[in-house]
C-alpha cells in the first residue's frame, strides 16, 4: 500500500492586499479516512485557518466541493487578504478517530502579501525660523509590503541629502511603515520653496507617491525698515514716511511714537504679493511742525509676526526759522531692526 | 488581455523609426509596460518603461537613443536615430498585477532590421 | 547597474531528469527576481516571479529559491516541451531598473 503524501504543489504564492488567495492542496490517496485541515504556522502555536467539519471561517471557501465523493482537492481560497494573513499555510492530513490524529503535513505554501505604501504625509516645524536657520520636516507613510522601499527628498526639484530614514519595525512583520526627517536652511528666498517626499514601491504601477510641504508655512522673513522725511509743506508740515520692506508672513502692525506717546497704531492687511512671496508696507505720519517748540522724536515701531518690536526713529528738528526746516534734520535708529 | 507590437521593418541608419504596441483588455492608465530587444541570437535586453501615469524611464545604456510614449490605448518607442546594431526583434510587455518587478504579458514581437 | 551572470550558458539532460539553473546578482535585489522561458522565434514566458513564487497555470515542476544574490531555477521530471531558453530579470528597488542574466539553453534528450 503506498503511504498517503499531502501535496502542496506551490511553495510560494504571492497576493495583493484585498485580493483573493488560493492554496492549493492535493492528497494522493482517500485512505485513511479522516478530515483535513488547514493551519497557518506550525507546532503548538498555529492557527487553525480551515476545518470542513466544524468552526465558521466566513473567508474561506474550499476550491472544490469537498463533501463530493472521492474528493481529493482540499485547497482553499482566502478572500479580502490582508497584510495580516502572511506566513506559511499548511495543509494537514488527520487520521478518523476520538480524538482525530495528525497523519501528514504538506511541505506547506509561503503567503507573502504585497500592500501599497499610504500618501506620505509631511510636516513642518511647529514655529516658524528665520534665514540661515535649519528646520526639520518630517514625512511618514504606512501600511506597505514587502519592507523594500526608498524615500527621496527634494526642495524646488533638487534632492536633499542631509535626511535621515527609517523603515520599523526592524524584523519580519506583517506590514511596515517609514519615517524620514529632512534638515532644510532657510533662506530669505523661500516664502515660495517647497519640499517634497517621494516613495517609491515595488506595488505603485504609476510614479512615485508624493507628499509636499510648503516653506511658507515653516519661514519668517523680518522686515527692513526705512523711516524718511519728504520737505516740508508750506502748511508747516512734515510727512515723515516709515517704509517696511519684504516681510513675510504678513501678519504685522505698526505704532508711530511722537516723543514715546503713542499717536497711531495700523495692523497690515491685504497687501499685494512681491515676486519672491514677500510683502511691503508704507505708512506715513504728517507732523505739524508749529505745534512744537522743541524737537520731534518720530518712532516707527514694528511688531511682525508676534516677534519682539523692532524700532526705527527720526528726529524733527524744531527751529526759530521754519523755511530752513527741510533740511534741519536727523534720524537714529533705536532698538535692533532684525534683517 | 494581450499586447501586440507593430511597426517593425526594413530602416536605415540614423532614419528614426517608431514601433507601437497595442493593449487589449487592460487599460494602460493602471499599468506599467516595458520595451525590449533581443538581437539575432542573443539574449534579451531591457530598454525602458513608461508609468501607468506616462513618465518614461530608461536602462542607462540608452542615452536618448529612444524615445518612450504612450495614448491612452497604445505605447510608443520612437528609434531616434538607429544604427545596424539595432537591428533585432523589439518587445513590448505589462507588469504583473501585483508589482513593478516582473513582466506576466509579452507580444509577440516585431522585427526591426537596421542596414545600409 | 545591476548585472546578471547566469550559468550554465548550455545544459543537456534527458526526459524525467533534473536540471538546475543559477543566476547571481551583483548586488542583493531582495528576491526581486523572476524566470522566462523562451521557445525559438516565440515570445518569453512568466515561470517564477519573487524569486519562488509560480505563476499561474505554471506546472509545479518548475521551483524558484534563492536570497540576497543568488537564486536557482529547478526543473524537475523534465519533458521534452521544456527544451527552451530560460533567463532570470532582476529589479532592483533603489535604481528602479531590470537587468536580464545571458540566458541557458536546456537541451532535453
Known amino acids: 500500500e503506498e503511504e498517503l503524501q499531502v501535496i502542496q504543489p506551490e511553495k510560494s504564492v504571492s497576493v495583493a492586499a484585498g485580493d483573493s488567495a488560493t492554496l492549493n492542496c492535493t492528497v494522493s490517496s482517500l485512505i485513511p479516512v479522516g478530515p483535513i485541515q488547514w493551519f497557518r504556522g506550525a507546532g503548538p502555536g498555529r492557527e487553525l485557518i480551515y476545518n470542513l467539519k466544524e468552526g465558521h471561517f466566513p473567508r474561506v471557501t474550499p476550491v472544490s466541493d469537498p463533501t463530493k465523493r472521492n474528493n481529493m482537492d482540499f485547497s482553499i481560497r482566502i478572500s479580502n487578504i490582508t497584510p495580516a494573513d502572511a506566513g506559511t499555510y499548511y495543509c494537514v492530513k488527520f487520521r478518523k478517530g476520538s480524538p482525530d490524529v495528525e497523519l501528514k503535513s504538506g511541505a506547506g505554501t509561503e503567503l507573502s502579501v504585497r500592500a501599497k505604501p499610504s500618501a506620505p504625509v509631511v510636516s513642518g516645524p511647529a514655529v516658524r525660523a528665520t534665514a540661515e536657520h535649519t528646520v526639520s520636516f518630517t514625512c511618514e507613510s504606512h501600511g506597505f509590503s514587502p519592507r523594500d522601499i526608498t524615500l527621496k527628498w527634494f526642495k524646488n526639484g533638487n534632492e536633499l541629502s542631509d535626511v535621515q530614514t527609517n523603515v520599523d519595525p526592524a524584523g519580519k512583520s506583517v506590514s511596515y511603515s517609514i519615517r524620514s526627517t529632512a534638515r532644510v536652511v532657510l533662506t530669505r528666498r523661500d516664502v515660495h520653496s517647497q519640499v517634497i517626499c517621494e516613495v517609491a514601491h515595488v506595488t505603485l504601477q504609476g510614479d512615485p507617491l508624493r507628499g509636499t510641504a510648503n516653506l511658507s508655512e515653516a519661514i519668517r522673513v523680518p522686515p527692513f525698515l526705512e523711516v524718511t522725511q519728504q520737505s516740508m509743506r508750506a502748511d508747516n508740515q512734515v510727512n515723515v514716511t516709515c517704509q517696511v520692506t519684504k516681510f513675510y508672513p504678513q501678519r504685522l502692525q505698526l505704532t508711530w511714537l511722537e516723543n514715546g506717546n503713542v499717536s497711531r497704531t495700523e495692523m497690515a492687511s491685504a497687501l499685494p504679493e512681491n515676486k519672491d512671496g514677500t510683502y511691503n508696507w508704507t505708512s506715513w505720519l504728517l507732523v505739524n511742525v508749529s505745534a512744537h517748540r522743541d524737537d520731534v522724536k518720530l518712532t516707527c515701531q514694528v511688531e511682525h509676526d508676534g516677534q519682539p518690536a523692532v524700532n526705527k526713529s527720526f528726529s524733527v528738528k524744531v527751529s526759530a526759522h521754519p523755511k530752513e526746516q527741510g533740511s534741519n534734520t536727523a534720524a537714529e535708529n533705536t532698538g535692533t531692526n532684525e534683517r | 488581455q494581450s499586447v501586440e507590437e507593430s511597426g517593425g521593418r526594413l530602416g536605415t541608419p540614423g532614419t528614426p523609426l517608431t514601433l507601437t504596441c497595442t493593449v487589449s483588455?487592460?487599460?494602460?492608465?493602471?499599468?506599467?509596460m516595458g520595451w525590449f530587444r533581443q538581437a539575432p541570437g542573443k539574449g534579451l535586453e531591457y530598454i525602458g518603461i513608461?508609468?501607468?501615469?506616462?513618465s518614461p524611464y530608461y536602462a542607462s545604456w540608452v542615452n536618448g537613443r529612444f524615445t518612450i510614449s504612450k495614448t491612452s490605448t497604445t505605447m510608443d518607442l520612437k528609434m531616434n536615430s538607429p544604427t545596424t546594431e539595432d537591428t533585432a526583434t523589439y518587445f513590448c510587455a505589462r507588469v504583473g498585477p501585483l508589482g513593478v518587478d516582473y513582466f506576466n504579458i509579452w507580444g509577440p514581437g516585431t522585427l526591426v532590421t537596421v542596414s545600409l | 547597474d545591476i548585472v546578471m551572470t547566469q550559468t550554465p550558458s548550455s545544459v543537456e539532460a534527458a526526459v524525467g531528469g533534473t536540471v538546475t539553473i543559477k543566476c547571481q546578482a551583483g548586488?542583493?535585489?531582495?528576491?526581486?527576481l523572476a524566470w522566462y522561458q523562451q521557445k525559438p522565434g516565440q515570445r518569453p514566458k512568466l515561470l517564477i516571479y519573487?524569486?519562488?513564487t509560480l505563476e499561474s497555470g505554471v506546472p509545479s515542476r518548475f521551483k524558484g529559491s534563492g536570497s540576497g544574490t543568488d537564486y536557482t531555477l529547478t526543473i524537475s521530471d523534465l519533458e521534452s516541451a521544456d527544451a527552451a531558453t530560460y533567463y532570470c530579470?532582476?529589479?532592483?528597488?533603489?535604481?528602479?531598473?531590470?537587468?536580464f542574466g545571458g540566458g541557458t539553453e536546456v537541451v532535453v534528450k
Open positions: 530579470q532582476s529589479w532592483h528597488y533603489i535604481s528602479r531598473s531590470y537587468a
Open positions: 548586488q542583493s535585489i531582495n528576491s526581486y
Open positions: 519573487y524569486a519562488s
Open positions: 513608461i508609468s501607468s501615469s506616462g
Open positions: 483588455g487592460f487599460s494602460l492608465s493602471s499599468y506599467v
